[in-house]
Interface confidence: low
């Protein structure tokens, strides 16, 4: 029943063009190119895409035509290597072009930049956007794909097509509405926020595959799909995991045409076999392709089958545990993970993987012992502290969030994480801590049974952002250690870090704490970021400052900004009052 068994094709490019259709083919090639060459101007990419598309059409007409038998990596790599400014724009990345496939593609992948030096996207006036949309809809939408793809080089390409479809629908609907802005802006905000979340989730999948291997990704997928489809048989879940792993391996490897094609096949398979997978798929399967795939990926967990037997019978009490384990270790562990996960939609995926790891370690030890059964009889008791640790952490942090609200909760995390890893750059600490803080409003509203999967799996995504940003410029051994030792223990590793006693405080620099009248025109979010940046810098100067000291300085700072923004001569106020604030802060913190 393999979804991806295909006949060999004389021309891979023709095959994908026919499967995907011209519109999706062009969009996916544009995404692929923009994710590789993140600094190239839009017009250059469009030109390359048009050339590839024209070539693909010649291959559709005659699969035996010259070069049509070449692999997609060869065709796309050759095209990227024609860019004249490759050396001056990308430096050593140009050396990739001297390599042969598959090394050349691997080289391009290694040069993807998670934090490219690109200007922030500024949203034009609604009327300007609507005019641009009406003047040239095709270019307008291509530009959206290009701008997102180059800033998010691991964005899940078929999902970006879904975002682009919603983006187009928003403009088509709202540019004809009576109040264009009221219609459009909330939709664009929603797309932006969902897009950032989607990008971060996919980045974790790619990191899992690239840094920890296929086995780690498959384990994650077994746990998640077993929670989502608890009525499905183990063989069915295994088949879905195999196919899903292929899809994500392709997308993370830059094989976007194959990835989108295979994702469509997987959605088709799931919908054709929904009776043996989940009762929750009916609505998803009635939707058009892009919406269908998205809907399946987000579908709620099916109800657990009634009267599931105790796990202990097969995995602890049975005399055949070591025999079954020895015969096929990964299959047996996969079955354990499947059975545990389908019974525990209330656990995070990472917790389930920790339990499976503990079970595996116990069997490795006990199946070599004199009395294996006696040795592993109490293995489930070892799970208790592993389950309680995230439960307690979430309870404490949700209480703190409810007491402080999101902004102050973020500030508490900023202080906590700056003290743990003060070497990390201030923008990264601010970005990561703000995102960590969003776990409160995202997850604490849920009932107990949904809190842990929401919170801990979200934290895994956010901490992966820290890991990929830190990998680009490593500055902290502690971050490297937590990021590389174990994928599923990243969050407990960071939680366990205490204040870094080896850190030498940063020299005080008054310029860091000098503010100007431009802060008054910023949005509330941007103003918060300014204040949080100052807070991180304070902690870097005075890592031993108490909560009370920091709170007093931050309260003074907020009052200072409010006062000067109301002043007639704002700039003078910021200059004069700013000096007083810096002096008072230094005194308060003993700097």
């Amino acid at each position: 029943r393999g979804v991806f068994r295909r006949d060999a094709h004389k021309s891979e490019v023709a095959h994908r063009f026919k499967d995907l259709g011209e519109e999706n083919f062009k969009a996916l090639v544009l995404i692929a190119f923009a994710q590789y060459l993140q600094q190239c101007p839009f017009e250059d990419h469009v030109k390359l895409v048009n050339e590839v598309t024209e070539f693909a059409k010649t291959c559709v007409a005659d699969e035996s035509a010259e070069n049509c038998d070449k692999s997609l990596h060869t065709l796309f790599g050759d095209k990227l290597c024609t860019v004249a400014t490759l050396r001056e724009t990308y430096g050593e990345m140009a050396d990739c072009c001297a390599k042969q496939e598959p090394e050349r593609n691997e080289c391009f992948l290694q040069h993807k930049d998670d934090n490219p030096n690109l200007p922030r996207l500024v949203r034009p006036e609604v009327d300007v956007m609507c005019t641009a949309f009406h003047d040239n809809e095709e270019t307008f939408l291509k530009k959206y794909l290009y701008e997102i793809a180059r800033r998010h080089p691991y964005f899940y390409a078929p999902e970006l097509l879904f975002f682009a479809k919603r983006y187009k629908a928003a403009f088509t609907e709202c540019c004809q509405a009576a109040d264009k802005a009221a219609c459009l802006l909330p939709k664009l905000d929603e797309l932006r926020d969902e897009g950032k979340a989607s990008s971060a989730k996919q980045r974790l999948k790619c990191a899992s595959l690239q840094k920890f291997g296929e086995r780690a990704f498959k384990a994650w997928a077994v746990a998640r799909l077993s929670q989502r489809f608890p009525k499905a048989e183990f063989a069915e879940v295994s088949k879905l995991v195999t196919d899903l792993t292929k899809v994500h391996t392709e997308c993370c490897h830059g094989d976007l045409l194959e990835c989108a094609d295979d994702r469509a096949d997987l959605a088709k398979y799931i919908c054709e076999n929904q009776d043996s997978i989940s009762s929750k798929l009916k609505e998803c399967c009635e939707k058009p392709l892009l919406e269908k795939s998205h809907c399946i990926a987000e579908v709620e967990n099916d109800e657990m089958p009634a009267d599931l037997p105790s796990l202990a019978a097969d995995f602890v009490e049975s005399k055949d545990v070591c025999k079954n384990y020895a015969e096929a270790k990964d299959v047996f562990l996969g079955m354990f993970l499947y059975e545990y996960a389908r019974r525990h939609p209330d656990y995070s995926v990472v917790l389930l993987l920790r339990l499976a790891k503990t079970y595996e370690t116990t069997l490795e030890k006990c199946c070599a012992a004199a009395d294996p059964h006696e040795c592993y009889a109490k293995v489930f008791d070892e799970f208790k502290p592993l389950v309680e640790e995230p439960q307690n952490l979430i309870k404490q942090n949700c209480e703190l969030f409810e007491q402080l609200g999101e902004y102050k909760f973020q500030n508490a995390l900023l202080v906590r994480y700056t003290k743990k890893v003060p070497q990390v750059s201030t923008p990264t600490l601010v970005e990561v801590s703000r995102n960590l803080g969003k776990v409160g409003s995202k997850c604490c509203k849920h009932p107990e049974a949904k809190r842990m999967p929401c919170a801990e799996d979200y934290l895994s995504v956010v901490l992966n952002q820290l890991c990929v940003l830190h990998e680009k410029t490593p500055v902290s051994d502690r971050v490297t250690k937590c990021c590389t030792e174990s994928l599923v223990n990243r969050r407990p590793c960071f939680s366990a870090l205490e204040v870094d006693e080896t850190y030498v405080p940063k020299e005080f620099n008054a310029e860091t704490f000098t503010f100007h009248a431009d802060i008054c025109t910023l949005s509330e979010k941007e103003r918060q970021i300014k204040k949080q940046t100052a807070l991180v810098e304070l902690v870097k100067h005075k890592p031993k400052a108490t909560k009370e000291q920091l709170k007093a300085v931050m309260d003074d700072f907020a009052a200072f900004v409010e006062k000067c923004c109301k002043a007639d001569d704002k700039e003078t106020c910021f200059a004069e009052e700013g000096k007083k604030l810096v002096a008072a802060s230094q005194a308060a913190l003993g700097l």
Epitope: H134, A169, T172, E173, Q176, A177, A178, P288
Partner: nanobody, 115 residues
Framework: QVQLVESGGGLVQPGGSLRLSCAAS????????MSWVRQAPGKGPEWVSA????????RYAESVKGRFTISRDNAKKTLYLQMNSLKPEDTAVYYC????????GSQGTQVTVSS
């Protein structure tokens, strides 16, 4: 410029029928799901029915199920709503919209059901 022009409304007795049309222009009609929305006097807009881009998938509000039928002709860029067994509570201005939105960008067509 996106344009949606509804027609076919009018005064009809309870139990009667009407067929509404919506002519679309200025966008790729065949690529979008479409909806009918209505607004009764003094009330907010109410979603009535939707159809996907190809015309295969149709959905209806409970209040009109079994009485109204939505359809489309992509070649003519036109959306239709066949309304049978009309009731006084169906009295409203009917609008067609892109997607399943209830935000209006057109004039609509008045349907009045009264004896």
């Amino acid at each position: 410029q996106v344009q949606l022009v509804e027609s076919g409304g009018g005064l009809v007795q309870p139990g009667g029928s009407l067929r509404l049309s919506c002519a679309a222009s200025g966008f790729t009609f065949g690529s979008f799901g479409m909806s009918w929305v209505r607004q009764a006097p003094g009330k907010g807009p109410e979603w009535v029915s939707a159809i996907d881009s190809g015309g295969a998938d149709t959905r209806y509000a409970e209040s009109v199920k079994g009485r109204f039928t939505i359809s489309r002709d992509n070649a003519k860029k036109t959306l239709y709503l066949q309304m049978n067994s009309l009731k006084p509570e169906d009295t409203a201005v009917y609008y067609c919209t892109i997607g399943q939105s209830t935000s209006r960008g057109s004039q609509g067509t008045q349907v009045t059901v009264s004896s």
